[in-house]
């Protein structure tokens, strides 16, 4: 028996369902009574789901997994993982045993888009050219960790005096806070871009300082 899985990682959004594809080629005359299918976590070998002795033994992994029972006889051994969590990320092994055995691993990459950044300024009044200001760009509930870029109004990257912190919440999602310390010119626009490296999703925020008042 030869087991095949997708080479590329499966990307799944948090709280959505994911399908980990796995297939084998049944011999003529194949029956489900001969099939032993085991899904497990590749690194720890923890059992996730199994089909043995001619029947679905069910989920051994937080009751969020399912096979495609009607498709098994055709060689479709894919696993459905419901309500994906950050902690589901990793490699899953599909192990198929009939007359002989084979296995292959598929990677699950979990992702969550970042919110549109909110911008805050400190101090936020009585600003004069030459003043040192702190601009904070905050974006929430994303995964994995973000990449943060700052630019001025001319699109020139601002790399000095930037401090970025990322904190995971109880669900494993990250809140990003990036602080830019800059000396004000006569007027100017400062924009931050929060990029999700897996989703290739960019979230933009900007603040424009034109004497008074401020625009965000």
């Amino acid at each position: 028996v030869e087991v095949q899985v997708s080479e590329d990682p499966v990307v799944a959004l948090v709280d959505t369902d994911a399908t980990l594809r796995c297939s084998f080629s049944p011999e003529p005359g194949f029956s489900l009574a001969q099939l032993n299918l085991i899904w497990q976590l590749t690194d720890t070998k923890q059992l996730v789901h199994s089909f043995t002795e001619g029947r679905d033994q069910g989920s051994a992994y937080s009751n969020r997994t399912a096979l495609f029972p009607d498709l098994l006889v055709q060689g479709n051994a894919s696993l459905r993982l419901q309500r994906v969590r950050v902690t589901d990320e990793g490699s899953y092994t599909c192990f198929v045993s009939i007359q002989d055995f084979d296995s292959a691993a598929v990677s699950l990459q979990v992702a969550a888009p970042y919110s549109k950044p909110s911008m805050t300024l400190e101090p936020n009044k009585d600003l004069r050219p030459g003043n040192m200001v702190t601009i904070t760009c905050s974006s929430y509930q994303g995964y994995p960790e973000a990449e943060v870029f700052w630019k001025d109004g001319q699109g020139v990257p601002l790399t000095g005096n930037v401090t970025t912190s990322q904190m995971a919440n109880e669900r494993g999602l990250f809140d990003v806070h990036s602080v830019l310390r800059v000396v004000l010119g006569a007027n100017g626009t400062y924009s931050c871009l929060v990029r999700n490296p897996v989703l290739q999703q960019d979230a933009h925020g900007s603040v424009t300082i034109t004497g008074q008042p401020l625009t965000f």
């Epitope: 085991i38 497990q40 070998k45 045993s97 002989d100 055995f101 084979d102 296995s103």
Partner: antibody, heavy 119, light 109 residues
């Protein structure tokens, strides 16, 4: 070329444990079904248990359940068989064996390890 | 647990004769049955797998047959090097577990 090289002969006291190793070369260690089979002097073959490293869970013959532990270290391509609470009847040659990749057949054997249990 | 019973325990024949060795299972083993040959001081050698398939390099004089609970190993014309102990072995479907028969000693008459 497939090779299974086992650790050397052991003399053990009753009640103690023995751990025999089996280093494999020639092929992807993780994808083989490895069995441990023993043969007491002048007696037949006895399958003790086996493991598929990539699968991870070992299976044991009923007779040895609770007394034998089979493990596999994928990083060194080595399988281990540990037998505890040894008695004189455990004196035997212990073989590790395996088949081709993905096969349950046992067609390659180690050279055997003689374990003697004697007071 | 499946028990395999081999008969006869000892078989005395002359070179050139036909040897028929029997293996009976206490319950059906599908076709997951193998035959091994073992000579003194050596590890066993796989002869037949899945009841009737010859392993690589095994001469055509060795053949296997049977299904379910009754299996036979036949050596059509004995060569001097064929005198040895023969074991049948079964494998359960899942989990993969094996049982050997007690062996048949094939000796020169």
């Amino acid at each position: 070329e497939v090779q299974l090289v086992q650790s050397g002969a052991e003399v053990k006291k009753p009640g103690s444990s023995v751990k025999v190793s089996c280093k494999a070369s020639g092929g992807t260690f993780s994808s083989y079904a490895i069995s441990w089979v023993r043969q007491a002097p002048g007696q037949g073959l006895e399958w003790m248990g086996g493991i598929i490293p990539i699968f991870g869970t070992a299976n044991y013959a009923q007779k040895f359940q609770g007394r034998v532990t089979i493990t596999a270290d994928e990083s060194t391509s080595t399988a281990y068989m540990e037998l505890s609470s040894l008695r004189s009847e455990d004196t035997a040659v212990y073989y590790c064996a395996r088949g081709e990749r993905g096969s349950y057949l046992i067609d390659y054997w180690g050279q055997g390890t003689l374990v003697t249990v004697s007071a | 647990e499946i028990v395999l019973t081999q008969s006869p325990a000892t078989l005395s024949l002359s070179p050139g004769e036909r040897a028929t060795l029997s293996c009976r299972a206490s319950q059906s083993v599908s076709s997951y049955l193998a035959w091994y040959q073992q000579k003194p001081g050596q590890a066993p050698r796989l002869l037949i797998y899945d009841a009737s398939n010859r392993a690589t390099g095994i001469p055509a004089r060795f053949s296997g047959s049977g299904s379910g609970t009754d299996f036979t190993l036949t050596i059509s014309s004995l060569e001097p090097e064929d005198f040895a102990v023969y074991y049948c072995q079964q494998r359960s479907n899942w989990p993969p577990m094996y049982t050997f028969g007690q062996g048949t000693k094939l000796e020169i008459k």
